[in-house]
């Protein structure tokens, strides 16, 4: 655009003047003036702002408590904030990952169709016919039943979704 | 306070190219648009185009199209200007220069508030 | 492009005199115009933006008026420091163009 119809994009108005924005890991002291330009401070130790800005204190790093499962997966800089996950076993309860819950077994008759990470819960599905889950696992998948037929072999108890076939000697014709 | 401190001068033979460095400091680089601007021995000045350093992207004058590339590296809040296939009449004093905004009655009214020293290119065979 | 014409283009003056210098814009331009000086060897310094505003630390003996196509800029009382040229620019339009120049000599 010829003339400018605003600041330009790292630029603030104040006071009819366009000011520098900080940039990220800085904190605004202060404006820019006809005489001065923008005052700029880095952020502290565990202190931290993300975008160019005019904020006047830096935002805290995030704390990742222990108490609720929580452990750092990526620590914290002067442009960013503190990634937190969740101890092994537990998973996050949000996006945010304030708190961790513990990951989720899948019941006799399911088994796991994606195991849990930091982030997301254990999936379960039920087990298809011809296969079953005789636990309850969060690392489990449903196992095949058992393949009477190739242990020379035949079926003498069907299996479902929680048992396994039961397999059994075939029937001798006696002379 | 605000610095542009631009490199030193130069001689260059008919069709080579030149790059001109301009090193700022005392402000935030990324915050304010870059121009350049050059002086022909005993003339007037004539206005060569802009950077925006925070993306990288230049607007060039026509007369320059083609033949001008305007650059810079914000890690070192440094801009330059290259003129590639250099004539005589390219013979001029390059200056780098600072956008300024004033906003009043409704209005965003830029001018160029601090310049480099300039940077001599001299173009002869 | 916009042309902008300046008078006179030489000006021979002496100290404590009221000069004027005018800029003539080939279309208009509103207010955006700005004035610089500039001394031998030196980059131009940037007097009055926005057609009447001064930049800060300009002494107050300058002043710039003006709208539209017609501009000018009053030295009230010249002092010996004020010999220079002194240019006007258009930044209503790409590309910013400048006028050719008014040269202010000591009578």
């Known amino acids: 655009p010829e003339p400018p119809t605003a600041c330009r994009e790292k630029q603030y108005l104040i006071n009819s003047q366009c000011c520098s924005l900080c940039q990220p890991g800085q904190k605004l002291v202060s404006d820019c003036t006809e005489f001065t330009e923008t005052e700029c401070l880095p952020c502290g130790e565990s202190e931290f702002l993300d975008t160019w800005n005019r904020e006047t204190h830096c935002h805290q790093h995030k704390y990742c408590d222990p108490n609720l499962g929580l452990r750092v997966q990526q620590k914290g800089t002067s442009e960013t904030d503190t990634i937190c996950t969740c101890e092994e076993g537990w998973h996050c309860t949000s996006e945010a990952c304030e708190s961790c819950v513990l990951h989720r077994s899948c019941s006799p008759g399911f088994g796991v169709k994606q195991i849990a990470t930091g982030v997301s819960d254990t999936i379960c599905e039920p087990c298809p016919v011809g296969f079953f889950s005789n636990v309850s696992s969060a690392f489990e998948k449903c196992h095949p039943w058992t393949s009477c037929e190739t242990k020379d072999l035949v079926v003498q108890q069907a299996g479902t979704n929680k048992t396994d076939v039961v397999c059994g000697p075939q029937d001798r014709l006696r002379a | 306070q605000v610095q542009l401190v631009q490199s030193g001068a130069e001689v260059k033979k008919p069709g080579a190219s030149v790059k001109v460095s301009c090193k700022a400091s005392?402000?935030?680089?990324?915050?304010?648009?870059m121009y350049w601007v050059r002086q022909a021995p005993g003339q007037g000045l004539e206005w060569m185009g802009w950077i925006n350093p925070d993306s990288g992207a230049p607007t060039y004058a026509q007369k320059f199209q083609g033949r001008v590339t305007m650059t810079r590296d914000t890690s070192i809040s440094t801009a330059y200007m290259e003129l590639s296939r250099l004539r005589s009449d390219d013979t001029a004093v390059y200056y780098c220069?600072?956008?300024?905004?004033?906003?009043?009655?409704?209005?965003?009214?830029?001018?160029?508030?601090?310049w480099g020293q300039g940077t001599l290119v001299t173009v002869s065979s | 492009d916009i042309q902008l014409t300046q008078s006179p283009s030489f000006l021979s003056a002496s100290v404590g005199d009221r000069v004027t210098i005018t800029c003539r814009a080939s279309q208009g331009i509103s207010s955006y115009l700005a004035w610089y000086q500039q001394k031998p060897g030196k980059a131009p310094k940037l007097l009055i933006y926005?057609?009447?505003t001064l930049q800060s630390g300009v002494p107050s003996r300058f002043s710039g008026s003006g709208s539209g196509t017609e501009f000018t800029l009053t030295i009230s009382s010249l002092q010996p420091e004020d010999f220079a040229t002194y240019y006007c620019q258009q930044l209503w339009s790409y590309p910013w163009t400048f006028g050719q120049g008014t040269k202010v000599e000591i009578k």
């Open positions: 005392g402000y935030t680089f990324a915050g304010y648009y």
């Open positions: 926005a057609a009447s």
């Open positions: 220069a600072r956008e300024k905004i004033y906003y009043g009655s409704g209005n965003y009214y830029p001018s160029f508030d601090y």
